[in-house]
Interface confidence: low
């Protein structure tokens, strides 16, 4: 069965200054490739977290993404402010050359 990306929470309400937990799980380890979190959609979407690389000072992962069989890609965003409001997407990429290819979005 083809991999599905599941974001079970349709909305998350967080008080200013608190931490938001955004849940995301994949139903399969195949295809191989990283997960990225975005706010908004389209080419101008804002990258919130990239499993592969980058510097995301307010983001921590709920589980250890380095573990080979991990399928939990949930993240926590600290010190929430009104500027963080928006729709967040958990996106699975398929490993490719030279660039990874977007495979499926939550």
């Amino acid at each position: 069965e083809e991999l599905q990306v599941i974001q079970p929470d349709k909305s998350v309400l967080v008080a200013a200054g608190e931490t938001a937990t955004l849940r995301c799980t994949a139903t399969s380890l195949i295809p191989v490739g990283p997960i990225q979190w975005f706010r908004g959609a389209g080419p101008g979407r804002e990258l919130i977290y990239n499993q592969k690389e980058g510097h995301f000072p307010r983001v921590t992962t709920v589980s250890d993404l380095t573990k080979r069989n991990n399928m939990d890609f949930s993240i926590r965003i600290g010190n929430i402010t009104p500027a963080d409001a928006g729709t967040y997407y958990c996106v699975k990429f398929r490993k490719g050359s030279p660039d990874d290819v977007e495979f499926k979005s939550g």
Epitope: G40, A41, P43, G44, F56, D84
Partner: antibody, heavy 125, light 113 residues
Framework: EVQLVESGGGLVQPGGSLRLSCAAS????????MNWVRQAPGKGLEWVSY????????YYADSVKGRFTISRDNAKNSLYLQMNSLRAEDTAVYYC??????????????????WGQGTTVTVSS | DIVMTQSPDSLAVSLGERATINCKSS????????????LAWYQQKPGQPPKLLIY???TRESGVPDRFSGSGSGTDFTLTISSLQAEDVAVYYC?????????FGGGTKVEIK
């Protein structure tokens, strides 16, 4: 009036450090992503760094990665660029620029719609 | 990175005549979901910071005179000044907004003949 004013430029020796500041006024600073863009003497524009409205996402050009640090203080309506290990090739006018779009969540969706006048950084021995 | 190539490097046009600047991207900047091209044009006059003229390849920024127009799609774009005025003497830059990092063209200098 929407305005960005840079400061902190100057003459510094190779290997030295500088901290640039950009003071914003006339708009809701905390709603906008911000950028630093530089222009070497007689040359074109080079994007340097980006910071999202809430500081959750930061990008750097490969040429400055590991040496420059972008930050912001929304309470003070200010953007900063800490520049370490400066090189001669960092000599340029540094502009802060607003990423248009506000709450659109798309940092470059309208281009960079407000620019400061720039501050000059000269790296020379 | 997406490479932006502008032509010509410089352009001399008589007052009141048309000026045309070209910009080519190394890959398409057209986003099929909304049919928008993520390309902007900037004007930089001597001693001044850049000014956003056009975004989405063809949408004029507020306050920009209608003699400035943008066209093109995919990888090939054009900025046209329909009737050159003395105050249009400047360097013009294109910039792609489609992928990080946002990259600029090398610039086209417009002068009066």
């Amino acid at each position: 009036e929407v305005q960005l004013v840079e400061s902190g430029g100057g003459l510094v020796q190779p290997g030295g450090s500088l901290r640039l500041s950009c003071a914003a006024s006339g708009f809701t600073f905390s709603s906008y992503s911000m950028n630093w863009v530089r222009q070497a003497p007689g040359k074109g524009l080079e994007w340097v760094s980006y910071i999202s409205s809430s500081s959750s996402t930061i990008y750097y050009a490969d040429s400055v990665k590991g040496r420059f640090t972008i930050s912001r203080d929304n309470a003070k309506n200010s953007l900063y660029l800490q520049m370490n290990s400066l090189r001669a090739e960092d000599t340029a006018v540094y502009y802060c620029a607003r990423g248009g779009g506000g709450y659109s969540y798309s940092p470059y969706i309208y281009g960079m719609d407000v620019w400061g006048q720039g501050t000059t950084v000269t790296v020379s021995s | 990175d997406i490479v932006m190539t502008q032509s010509p490097d410089s352009l001399a046009v008589s007052l009141g005549e048309r000026a045309t600047i070209n910009c080519k991207s190394s890959q398409s900047v057209l986003y099929s979901s909304n049919n928008k091209n993520y390309l902007a044009w900037y004007q930089q006059k001597p001693g001044q910071p850049p000014k956003l003229l056009i975004y989405w390849a063809s949408t004029r920024e507020s306050g920009v005179p209608d003699r400035f127009s943008g066209s093109g799609s995919g990888t090939d774009f054009t900025l046209t000044i329909s009737s050159l005025q003395a105050e249009d003497v400047a360097v013009y830059y294109c910039q792609q907004l489609y992928l990080y990092p946002p990259t600029f063209g090398g610039g086209t200098k417009v002068e009066i003949k």
